[in-house]
């Protein structure tokens, strides 16, 4: 006999990286018929939802109106059908950004390179941090972690057209508190014409909504959203 229900999905909308003082919604998707959802923060109960009518609802939303460092951390959710509880969801790392300062991102030998050339990004921040994060914008959400007293280097090695795209970096004061994002650096990799034309480029965020990759479809893409965030979140652990 089944002792627990399948674990729910958890994700943040519009994104798990939240600028300070901005709002975010933590979503938990379980099963139709769930009479209670619980959201846990760092292992302690944070909020409870008892959806009505439960048989018509399989997703609940926990609204956080004003993101700050006290709200940043690891969240998980569970749900109950009758007296039977689910397994806990995966952990959601909610990160507060736009803390303190803005790093500078540069690229060597430059933003326009030839396929096969070695490229290194440099992220510099003069305040007290020793961990840096380099993110390539787009759905694949590539994240690299680097270390250094005031600067970290991110060698990409010999690049291909798949490395094309817009990059930003953050200084990290702890796992869940990041600096303002750097200004974007767009890397242009040219190869032979055939390769260049065929290489798909990640969709990038609009310049004014960086970091808020919106998934407006309620079904189908939610798991993609969780998987997409998962790449970046693994670096936080």
């Amino acid at each position: 006999q089944q002792q627990t229900l399948p674990k729910p999905f958890i994700w943040a909308e519009p994104h798990f990286m939240v600028p300070k003082e901005k709002q975010v919604t933590i979503c938990c998707q379980g099963n139709y018929g769930a009479v209670e959802y619980q959201l846990h923060f760092e292992g302690s109960l944070f909020a409870v939802d008892r959806p009505k009518p439960p048989e018509r609802i399989n997703k609940v939303q926990f609204y956080i109106p004003d993101m700050n460092s006290r709200m940043a951390g690891q969240y998980s959710c569970i749900y109950r059908v009758g007296e039977l509880w689910s397994e806990p969801s995966n952990l959601l790392d909610l990160v507060v950004t736009e803390m303190y300062d803005t790093p500078t991102l540069s690229v060597h030998p430059g933003p326009e390179v030839i396929s096969g050339e070695k490229v290194t990004f440099y992220c510099r921040l003069d305040t007290a941090t020793s961990m840096f994060l380099l993110l390539k914008e787009g759905r694949s959400s590539h994240v690299q972690r680097g270390y250094g007293k005031v600067q970290a280097e991110f060698p990409l090695g010999p690049v291909t057209t798949a490395h094309r795209g817009t990059y930003r970096c953050f200084g990290s004061y702890n796992n869940h508190a990041w600096s303002f994002p750097s200004e974007p650096v767009k890397l242009l990799v040219t190869g032979d014409i055939e390769n260049t034309s065929l290489a798909p480029e990640d969709p990038t965020f609009p310049a004014d909504t960086w970091g808020t990759y919106l998934l407006t479809t309620e079904t189908g893409l939610q798991k993609d959203h969780a998987l997409w965030d998962h790449t970046a979140q693994n670096l936080l652990r």
């Epitope: 709002q23 919604t25 923060f41 302690s44 109960l45 944070f46 909020a47 409870v48 939802d49 008892r50 959806p51 009505k52 609940v60 939303q61 926990f62 609204y63 956080i64 109106p65 004003d66 006290r70 709200m71």
Partner: nanobody, 130 residues
Framework: EVQLVESGGGLVQPGGSLRLSCAVS????????MGWFRQAPGKGREFVAA????????YYADSVKGRFTISRDNSKNTAYLQMNSLRAEDTAVYYC???????????????????????WGQGTLVTVSS
């Protein structure tokens, strides 16, 4: 400016009852989840009870379940905590709290963590003693 003002505290004998009130001004009370917390002498702040803005969901700490009842009257911008069968260990300063932000809260959500609340009252003392 947001103001939360508790009232109704006092001295009561074990087994007795009290009703605490929390009047809220300066916010759109009717769409805000609310909570009650308490702090006993020499101890940390402890969750007591919470209520969704629609009153459809209430949630209680195990230590008060079956004895305390949280309610609200949105037309009066007031939340209540009815406390029955009071015990000596219920002695504490009781605080009401309101979540922050705008009107985007689900009608069925309650918050149990103190960090989720933005605005707090000054507290009212409840003493249970014979």
């Amino acid at each position: 400016e947001v103001q939360l003002v508790e009232s109704g505290g006092g001295l009561v004998q074990p087994g007795g009852s009290l009703r605490l009130s929390c009047a809220v001004s300066g916010r759109t009370f009717s769409r805000l989840p609310m909570g009650w917390f308490r702090q006993a002498p020499g101890k940390g702040r402890e969750f007591v009870a919470a209520i969704s803005w629609s009153s459809s969901t209430t949630y209680y700490a195990d230590s008060v379940k079956g004895r305390f009842t949280i309610s609200r009257d949105n037309s009066k911008n007031t939340a209540y905590l009815q406390m029955n069968s009071l015990r000596a260990e219920d002695t504490a300063v009781y605080y009401c709290a309101a979540v922050g932000g705008s009107l985007d809260y689900s009608a069925t959500v309650v918050y149990t963590a103190a960090r989720a609340y933005a605005d707090w009252g000054q507290g009212t003392l409840v003493t249970v003693s014979s």
